[in-house]
Interface confidence: medium
Amino acid sequence: MGSAALEILGLVLCLVGWGGLILACALPQWRIYSYAGDNIVTAQAMYEGLWMSCVVQSTGHMQCKVYDSVLALSTEVQAARALTVSAVLLAFVALFVTLAGAQCTTCVAPGPAKARVALTGGVLYLFCGLLALVPLCWFANIVVREFYDPSVPVSQKYELGAALYIGWAATALLMVGGCLLCCGAWVCTGRPDLSFPVKYSAPRRPTATGDYDKKNYV
């Protein structure tokens, strides 16, 4: 596969991953709680997320309440908020860096500097995935640990929510996409040394492996 094709595939995966990460961040199903005790007969399930908690009635009606105070939130929720939002914002930055370094755009000159810009975009997406993975795994670890902890009453046991699975899928896409973007700029077209300083200006765009690419001709 040519480096341009790798870049396009990588960018598509990263964009899908980014969308998935935003979805995971917004959804209330980070942990779910089902309990049919006497005092909540009408409740079918409870969801807890980073921004709100929801109760789903047996009728299918869902009522959600946004968390009032940040200070009242648990440490893991606060940390998960900060890290997930950081990952979403970093992915936004990575998008522009990747587009600047992409072979089909014209904002950076085609030479070696452009390869390093593209490589930076890939690395940012890779880091993005890792950054988002931290709160997801941390949250999941707490849920699983409490689920198997005999000292935690049944009425307080939660299960892993859909948002965590969506988040994991998103981080996988971000990391795979980031790797493909790095490949497009690195493996396929000369493998620039990451530590090598860029010593020249840059205006422009490329086709790294496209020796006699038909689109170049009149």
Epitope: P112, P203, T209
Partner: antibody, heavy 119, light 107 residues
């Protein structure tokens, strides 16, 4: 069929300005970059500069202060202007297609034009 | 600037034998090296790009190898038409630079 052809004066007076034209056929300058390379008699090749497909330019530091590369996309021509010429600037001047890759090379070359700087 | 040193400066060969031309970079440039052939009174012609990638319309007897600082252009079974000067060029960083060339002579 891709072709590049250089044209310009064969003789230039010292301290004067050299103007060369590279006429490109079979390629669109909107999608292709063009470099200028020179070769003094009996010596090696020296990359002078490039005009990228988006119109941006890069120059070799050895000639940066004296060199200007421009283009006319409607005529599919690339121009080289080099001022303050000295006898050591006498060389064969080539224009070459430079694929817009991360690591540029030259896959199509003109036949070259010999420029002699002499009074 | 990255300096490319080609050796030997001149190489005498008999038709049919295989030869290796060397190009050494002043710093690691990965595989960002390209090889050209220039016959007398002609413009250069691209032979190999990115150290080892062959170019269409170029005879298969020309091959390239190497990575980092040391690169080699190999001609398997030299023919009389291969009498030329061979240049390596780096594109790892601007300015793009060429080696001083290796002149291939036929004995």
């Amino acid at each position: 069929q891709v072709q590049l052809k250089e044209s310009g004066p064969g003789l230039v007076q010292p301290s004067q300005t050299l103007s060369l034209t590279c006429t490109v056929s079979g390629l669109s300058l909107i999608r292709n970059s063009v470099s200028w390379i020179r070769q003094p008699p009996g010596k090696g090749l020296e990359w002078m500069g490039v005009i990228w497909s988006n119109g941006g330019t890069e120059y070799n530091s050895t000639v940066k202060s004296r060199l200007s590369i421009s283009r006319d996309t409607s005529k599919n021509q690339v121009f080289l202007k080099m001022n303050s010429l000295q006898t050591e600037d006498s060389a064969m001047f080539f224009c070459a297609r430079t694929p817009d890759g991360y690591y540029p090379y030259f896959d199509y070359w003109g036949q070259g034009v010999m420029v002699t700087v002499s009074s | 600037d990255i300096v490319l040193t080609q050796s030997p400066a001149t190489l005498s060969v008999t038709p049919g034998e295989s030869v290796s031309l060397s190009c050494r970079a002043s710093q690691g440039i990965s595989t960002s090296i390209h090889w050209y052939q220039q016959k007398s009174n002609e413009s250069p012609r691209l032979l190999i790009r990115y150290a080892s990638q062959s170019i269409s319309r170029i005879p298969s007897r020309f091959s390239g190898s190497g990575s980092g600082t040391d690169f080699t252009l190999t001609i398997n079974g030299v023919e009389s038409e291969d009498l030329s000067v061979y240049y390596c060029q780096q594109s790892y960083n601007l300015p793009l630079t060429f080696g001083s060339g290796t002149k291939l002579e036929i004995k």
